[in-house]
């Protein structure tokens, strides 16, 4: 059974994941982002179901494509590079989903834009956090 300290740790990790996903989304949605139109042409796989931490496997599998799309913003001077953000997200995802059980991700039939993809995982984080508080 999860202890209050492990629940607190999970909540903090989810909050950090949420913050970095929101940061990426904000940067993409910035009206001054000249690469937004091109970024929106890339398609991402969406999870068929995302209600438990094990479903983060579906996010993990899309992190490399996400980094590649974010690298389109190469004309900017980065405080944080896309690889810094993706690396941190990857570490959090691995800790949250655990490695005890192998979960095969099932994807929805329709793909999504980067904005829809990020919004989906932001909603996931918010939903899980709400069950922990």
């Amino acid at each position: 059974a999860p202890t209050s300290s492990s629940t607190k740790k999970t909540q903090l990790q989810l909050e950090h994941l949420l913050l970095d996903l929101q940061m990426i989304l904000n940067g993409i949605n910035n009206y001054k982002n000249p690469k937004l139109t091109r970024m929106l042409t890339f398609k991402f796989y969406m999870p068929k179901k995302a209600t438990e931490l094990k479903h983060l496997q579906c996010l993990e599998e899309e992190l490399k494509p996400l980094e590649e799309v974010l690298n389109l913003a190469q004309s900017k001077n980065f405080h944080l590079r896309p690889r810094d953000l993706i690396s941190n997200i990857n570490v959090i995802v691995l800790e949250l989903k655990g490695s005890e059980t192998t979960f095969m991700c099932e994807y929805a039939d329709e793909t999504a834009t980067i904005v829809e993809f990020l919004n989906r995982w932001i909603t996931f984080c918010q939903s899980i956090i709400s069950t922990l508080t």
């Epitope: 970095d20 996903l21 929101q22 900017k76 959090i92």
Partner: nanobody, 119 residues
Framework: EVQLVESGGGLVQPGGSLRLSCAAS????????MGWYRQAPGKQRELVAA???????NYPDSVKGRFTISRDNAKNTVYLQMNSLKPEDTAVYYC?????????????WGQGTQVTVSS
């Protein structure tokens, strides 16, 4: 408006340590990047370390393994622990607050704190 107050600079011998702090106040959003840049006389401003509110960090090779950035989101404060300092680390260190991971005209900068590494 965002106000940034830096502290912790000073004179230190080569091989020594210093800890810089920067507290942000004003129109702070929960999603942000805070960090440190430095500028030595006659040189361009350069990144020292940056950290997102979610914990993502960036260090240039010149400080990797020697400097550690951390933050307290509840206090809107960022810290820079500088170990194994070298004379070439001498510069004015500026705290930075940004709403995105890339540079923007809406970024905010502190007044700067002098770090001098000399025997």
């Amino acid at each position: 408006e965002v106000q940034l107050v830096e502290s912790g600079g000073g004179l230190v011998q080569p091989g020594g340590s210093l800890r810089l702090s920067c507290a942000a106040s004003g129109s702070i959003f929960s999603i942000n990047v805070m960090g440190w840049y430095r500028q030595a006389p006659g040189k361009q401003r350069e990144l020292v370390a940056a950290i997102s509110s979610g914990g993502s960090t960036n260090y240039p090779d010149s400080v990797k393994g020697r400097f550690t950035i951390s933050r307290d989101n509840a206090k809107n404060t960022v810290y820079l622990q500088m170990n194994s300092l070298k004379p070439e680390d001498t510069a004015v260190y500026y705290c930075m607050y940004a709403s995105s991971w890339y540079e923007d005209e809406t970024d905010y900068w502190g007044q700067g704190t002098q770090v001098t590494v000399s025997s």
